[in-house]
Structures are given as structure tokens and as C-alpha cells.
Amino acid sequence: VSPTFQVVNSIAPVQECSTQLDIVIVLDGSNSIYPWDSVTAFLNDLLERMDIGPKQTQVGIVQYGENVTHEFNLNKYSSTEEVLVAAKKIVQRGGRQTMTALGIDTARKEAFTEARGARRGVKKVMVIVTDGESHDNHRLKKVIQDCEDENIQRFSIAILGSYNRGNLSTEKFVEEIKSIASEPTEKHFFNVSDELALVTIVKTLGERIFALEAT
């Protein structure tokens, strides 16, 4: 051993996912999502587990409600730290309508293009977070099939907050969001009681996303 050898304290990285994936997170930003910082906390906890970079995992975020906004593209940031800073700054765009089919279709057609950073041969993953039945659900079946045709793996998360606040039945909503998830549904669909509970699914969601690279 060299005489200059010394022990240096090292910190184990938070990242658990050092795989190559192109992940687009599709966020419902309509008014009924409350409080919004529960969503940004969820994003933070999920993203800090990822090893983000041009040769590792890339993340893009799309927000929808009445219309769709690309918050940032897959190739916008080249490190986990940069993505965490950007995700924290995402503001809720509001709106009363929940155009989920439009959000998913825009992510498929636009966010997953090479122009926005998608890489050929890299597995595509979409994470959809919403709290209400879509106002364009007549389009949902075709939109999901289009994603399926393009081999986009879909994880869907149903937030039951607005239903519980209004003492409304969640049955129809849960069925719709389950229909968005890839098969097997039980591994791709999550539901949480309210927005505050989003952080409780991060570990499991992260593990299931990262497991995709092994399949």
C-alpha cells in the first residue's frame, strides 16, 4: 500500500437506479390536487433515487389539466441534482378539467420524441399521477393502445383525496386509472388516500420502475 494511502469518509449515494430508462412523469395539475407541495415532495423523493444523466436515466415532466405543458424535456438536465432543483420549482397550472387522455397522448407523441431527448432502444416509462376521472375518457382506450403499440410501460397513481373530501364513490375513478396501467395491473397501479400520502408509495414505485431494466 502506498504511504500516501488514507481512508476517506465516503457517503453512499441516495440513487438506487443506475439503469438506462427514459421516464416521463405525467402530472395532473388541476385545482383539485391539493396541496400541490405534496406532489413536489413526491417528485423529490422519487427523483433523488435515480441516477440521472445522458447515459443513464433521463426524466421529463409533463403537466396537464385543461391543456398540457412540457415542464422539462428528457434531455434538459444531465444530473439528478439539476432535475431535483427544476422539479421543486414546478408550479401548479390549475384548471377545472382533467384531460388525462390528452396528457398521456401528448407525452407519447411529443415527450418521447428524439427531438425532446428520447433515445433509440432505451425503454420508455410513463408515470401518470391524477386525482379524478378524465373529461376526455372517450379517448382513453385508443390513447392507451397507442402507448402499448409503442412499448411504453405505464405506472398509474390514483389520488383519492378529492373523492374522500366529497364523500364520493371512488369505484369508477379507480377502474379508469387501473385501465391506464400496464399489465400486470397489480404491479403498475397504485392508489393513495390523499395527496399527503403520495410519498408513502415512492419506495415501491421506484423499485418497480428500476426492475424494468432487468426484464
Epitope: 385545482n31 401548479q92 377545472r96 373530501r165
Partner: antibody, heavy 124, light 108 residues
Framework: EVQLVQSGAEVKKPGESLRISCKGS????????IGWVRQMPGKGLEWMGI????????RYSPSFQGQVTISADKSISTAYLQWSSLKASDTAMYYC??????????????????WGQGTLVTVS | EIVLTQSPGTLSLSPGERATLSCRAS???????LAWYQQKPAQAPRLLIY???RRATGIPDRFSGSGSGTDFTLTISRLEPEDFAVYYC?????????FGQGTTVEIK
């Protein structure tokens, strides 16, 4: 930068009509509810009602139902509070505020994150 | 409707001291949907805390909120000169917004 800018102070006589305004900027004004809050001289805050400028859906506090009218013109990102016949007891500071939350179906919830500077209405 | 009662009505303290403001609801506030606002003379209210304990953007960490159900507290750990003002609590869990009557924090 999110801003709510209210119209200037008004001095009116009892029985007169009045409309005050609140113009939003720096965010998608048609996508957030706007509330109105009254503060009588030396007193606390009272919620009056709320409107969604995107489609003018409106809810009123029972205490103010029938006493005032809340409206909006989404083309100019402005919400209004109006009286058809003012009373001396309407003398107060009136604030508009943006709701971070929702008011769909039977449930309303959320906090007011941005406020206008206030419009003082004096009726005497 | 839910009635909010704030206490004390007035709190006389010196800069650097700790301020504890109480807000009690006549019935349980659902999902801890309670906010705190600060209002200075001739100014609009300013959001401090929402969902009982979450600090609004730009609010210093000397302000903290706690509580659930019917009892809520706003704490200012060390009073700064600019903190002397009126503080209102507000509930929003019942399709209506109601405010407490306010607590005045004044310089001793």
C-alpha cells in the same frame, strides 16, 4: 410574478350602486378561483364568496348571498364585486385573493395564497 | 359553520421572545385544513401557514404551525421587529372559509 391589482378607493352615498375590480396577472387567471374577503373598520376578515373566472361558476357565503354579486370577465383576467344599493354598513376594506385549492361539486377547500392590495369602500 | 376562537386577544412581548398563538375550532377541522395569515396595518393579509403546519413560500422558519382536530397553534420562535402584527387563523374544510377574530402581537 403573481399579482392581483384592485381598483382604487371609492366614496359613495347610501342607495348608490358600485362595482370594484380585481385584475390578475402572472398566472393563468382563468384556471384559479378568486375569492372576496371583507374587513370592516377595526374588525376581522370575513369570506364573502368565490368565482372561477374560466366559466364564472360562483359560490357565496350565506351571510352575503343576495347582498352582493360576484362576476368575472375572463377576456381581461378580471373579477368583480358589485352592489346594487349600498348601505352605510358596507363601509369596509375589500380584498380579492387567489385560491390554491378547488370548489368543485359540493366541496370547497384550499387557502388564499396571493392577495390584492385592497379597495376601501366608504358609504356615507 | 365552524367558529374559530383565537387566544389571547393581545400578546405583549419583546423582540427575541417566543410567541405562542392559539386557535380553537368549535368542531373538528377536516384534514387539518387550517391556515394562518399575518396582517400589518394598512396592508393585505399574507399567508404564513397552510394545512396546519406547512410554511408558505418565502416565510422564515421561525414561524411554525402545529395541531389537528380542534386545537391549532402558531409559534414564532424568536420575534423580530417586523413580526408585530395581527394574526388570523382560517379553516377551509367545510365548503366555507371562516376566520378567527385575530390575535394582536404587540411590542411590550
Amino acid at each position: 410574478e403573481v399579482q392581483l391589482v384592485q381598483s382604487g378607493a371609492e366614496v359613495k352615498k347610501p342607495g348608490e350602486s358600485l362595482r370594484i375590480s380585481c385584475k390578475g396577472s402572472g398566472y393563468s387567471v382563468t384556471s384559479y378561483w378568486i375569492g372576496w374577503v371583507r374587513q370592516m373598520p377595526g374588525k376581522g376578515l370575513e369570506w364573502m364568496g368565490i368565482i372561477y373566472p374560466g366559466d364564472s361558476d360562483t359560490r357565496y357565503s350565506p351571510s352575503f348571498q343576495g347582498q352582493v354579486t360576484i362576476s368575472a370577465d375572463k377576456s381581461i383576467s378580471t373579477a368583480y364585486l358589485q352592489w346594487s344599493s349600498l348601505k352605510a354598513s358596507d363601509t369596509a376594506m375589500y380584498y380579492c385573493a387567489r385560491l390554491q385549492g378547488d370548489c368543485s361539486g359540493g366541496t370547497c377547500y384550499g387557502h388564499f395564497d396571493y392577495w390584492g392590495q385592497g379597495t376601501l369602500v366608504t358609504v356615507s | 359553520e365552524i367558529v374559530l376562537t383565537q387566544s389571547p386577544g393581545t400578546l405583549s412581548l419583546s423582540p427575541g421572545e417566543r410567541a405562542t398563538l392559539s386557535c380553537r375550532a368549535s368542531q373538528s377541522v377536516s384534514s387539518s385544513y387550517l391556515a394562518w395569515y399575518q396582517q400589518k396595518p394598512a396592508q393585505a393579509p399574507r399567508l404564513l401557514i397552510y394545512v396546519a403546519s406547512r410554511r408558505a413560500t418565502g416565510i422564515p422558519d421561525r414561524f411554525s404551525g402545529s395541531g389537528s382536530g380542534t386545537d391549532f397553534t402558531l409559534t414564532i420562535s424568536r420575534l423580530e421587529p417586523e413580526d408585530f402584527a395581527v394574526y388570523y387563523c382560517q379553516q377551509y374544510g367545510t365548503s366555507s372559509w371562516t376566520f378567527g377574530q385575530g390575535t394582536t402581537v404587540e411590542i411590550k
